[in-house]
């Protein structure tokens, strides 16, 4: 069970990031799926490591003083969401932007159903060129 | 099937970083082949997370203005290399260089005699102190 | 057989970080252990996928001029330690301190009673809100 | 809207090199992998040289070979070929041309071409 999506630019104002299965994806079988463009869903109960890789462009001037902060986060049936990772950058002070990559990772047991997503500050300033922003998981 | 191999500083110009097989590496059998010392070559098709960590030093004076990008790119039999993973880092004021680190990962199916091959802006700006700069790859 | 713990802030004065077994953590069997909540020992050979991300906070004034700098490291018995992996991130400019995460991960061969850790060069400076700062593994 | 112009082109005498440059815009330049055609007067169109999407892969026809080099810089959008010990067979208009999709490399399937470039041979 294995899944890679690729990021897709948005005009829904949610800092869940956009996901497809387009380019150079993977979706292993129907034991995972790309649900509403947003949350890889597993049917199978496990341990999984999951990923993601944000690549986002912010100057610190234009930008909240708060850093850039990506979170993978973890939905289980009848559970309230909790973050499992997350990663945060400051915002650079190059002009107009500056290109930055994140990326997190981990091994953690899933429950029939469960889906994660990943969560930003601001969808606006994520890099959607090829291969910048994807996110994945694969089953132990 | 599993592969970790250490970069190596070259002499040649071109922008795909060589690897070698020294210090902690591992090449778990002959399915997988470091080619030329440039490419993670494999025999078996499949699902392979595969994943590149590249350290580099640069200043934002000293540097064109383009970041510094780093791509996980992919060659099959028979068809022009394409791009799976890419992350980007705007260069650093400090100086002389400004170390920063890259980590690029994720889930991807393979061909028989697939290479797989990491590029860089700027090879020169790459650090190949112990443990700084690798590359590898797992069957899943 | 797998492992994911979670950063924890220590009064200690070493290098080496320290981890716990809470929050949304995962030790899948007796096969791999937290020792002395300082590093991740396996009773098993063979191939493992080993990561630590970890997020900082640093200010260039404020730190020495070195960089910071995050090292995977191993334990063999009877052997001394060595160096696995190494990220390393320039201090920013932002202040107080400015946020940066790095990601570290590679395969390789553990023998029985091996051990891995993660070492900073600055531990205070370590971020220990939930999901920044984490270390794992899992056997192929 | 794709575009692709042609510069570098000139007048040249016979052993002597040129330098020609095609900015590309209007597409994802880094991705596709890019040739370069020309055409002799009088003549039909030849292919000249193709380089791949990262520059990893290059291939040249055998009258070029060893005289010729293609190069891309994929921070500019743009493609060069260098073109060393010039001979007057070498006179004609130099086209770049984009791959419609970055598949086989057997395939020579373009979809869009530039206006040319001169380049002439004569003593």
């Known amino acids: 069970i294995a899944a890679h999506v690729i990021s897709e630019a948005s005009s829904k104002t949610t800092s869940v990031l956009q996901w497809a299965e387009k380019g150079y994806y993977t979706m292993s079988n129907n034991l995972v799926t790309l649900e509403n463009g947003k949350q890889l869903t597993v049917k199978r109960q496990g341990l999984y490591y999951i990923y993601a890789q944000v690549t986002f462009c912010s100057n610190r001037e234009a930008s909240s003083q708060a850093p850039f902060i990506a979170s993978l986060c973890l939905k289980s049936p009848g559970r309230f969401e909790r973050i499992l990772l997350r990663a945060a950058n400051t915002h650079s002070s190059a002009k107009p932007c500056g290109q930055q990559s994140i990326h997190l990772g981990g091994v953690f047991e899933l429950q029939p159903g469960a889906s994660v997503f990943v969560n930003v500050t601001d969808p606006s300033q994520v890099s959607h060129g090829t291969g910048f922003t994807s996110f994945g998981l694969l089953k132990l | 099937i599993a592969a970790h191999v250490i970069s190596e500083a070259s002499s040649k110009t071109t922008s795909v970083l060589q690897w070698a097989e020294k210090g902690y590496y591992t090449m778990s059998n002959n399915l997988v082949t470091l080619e030329n010392g440039k490419q993670l070559t494999v025999k078996r098709q499949g699902l392979y997370y595969i994943y590149a960590q590249v350290t580099f030093c640069s200043n934002r004076e000293a540097s064109s203005q383009a970041p510094f990008i780093a791509s996980l790119c992919l060659k099959s039999p028979g068809r022009f290399e394409r791009i799976l993973l890419r992350a980007a880092n705007t260069h650093s004021s400090a100086k002389p260089c400004g170390q920063q680190s890259i980590h690029l990962g994720g889930v991807f199916e393979l061909q028989p005699g697939a290479s797989v091959f990491v590029n860089v802006t700027d090879p020169s700006q790459v650090s190949h102190g112990t443990g700084f700069t690798s590359f590898g790859l797992l069957k899943l | 057989i797998a492992a994911h713990v979670i950063s924890e802030a220590s009064s200690k004065t070493t290098s080496v970080l320290q981890w716990a077994e809470k929050g949304y953590y995962t030790m899948s069997n007796n096969l791999v252990t937290l020792e002395n909540g300082k590093q991740l020992t396996v009773k098993r050979q063979g191939l493992y996928y080993i990561y630590a991300q970890v997020t900082f906070c640093s200010n260039r004034e404020a730190s020495s001029q070195a960089p910071f700098i995050a090292s995977l490291c191993l334990k063999s018995p009877g052997r001394f330690e060595r160096i696995l992996l190494r990220a390393a991130n320039t201090h920013s400019s932002a202040k107080p301190c400015g946020q940066q995460s790095i990601h570290l991960g590679g395969v390789f061969e553990l023998q029985p009673g091996a051990s891995v850790f993660v070492n900073v060069t600055d531990p205070s400076q370590v971020s220990h809100g939930t999901g920044f700062t984490s270390f794992g593994l899992l056997k192929l | 809207e794709v575009q692709l112009l042609e510069s570098g082109g000139g007048l040249v005498q016979p052993g002597g090199s040129l330098r020609l440059s095609c900015a590309a815009s209007g597409f994802t330049f880094e991705l596709y992998p890019m040739s370069w055609v020309r055409q002799a007067p009088g003549k039909g169109l030849e292919w000249v040289s193709t380089?791949?999407?990262?520059?990893?892969?290059?291939y040249y026809a055998d009258s070029v070979k060893g005289r010729f080099t293609i190069s891309r810089d994929n921070s500019k959008n743009t493609l060069y070929l260098q073109m060393n010990s010039l001979r007057a067979e070498d006179t004609a208009v130099y086209y770049c041309?984009?791959?419609?999709?970055?598949?086989?490399?057997?395939?020579?399937?373009?979809?869009?071409w530039g206006q040319g470039t001169l380049v002439t041979v004569s003593s």
């Open positions: 041309a984009k791959f419609k999709r970055s598949g086989k490399t057997d395939d020579t399937n373009f979809d869009y």
């Open positions: 380089i791949s999407p990262t520059g990893l892969l290059t």
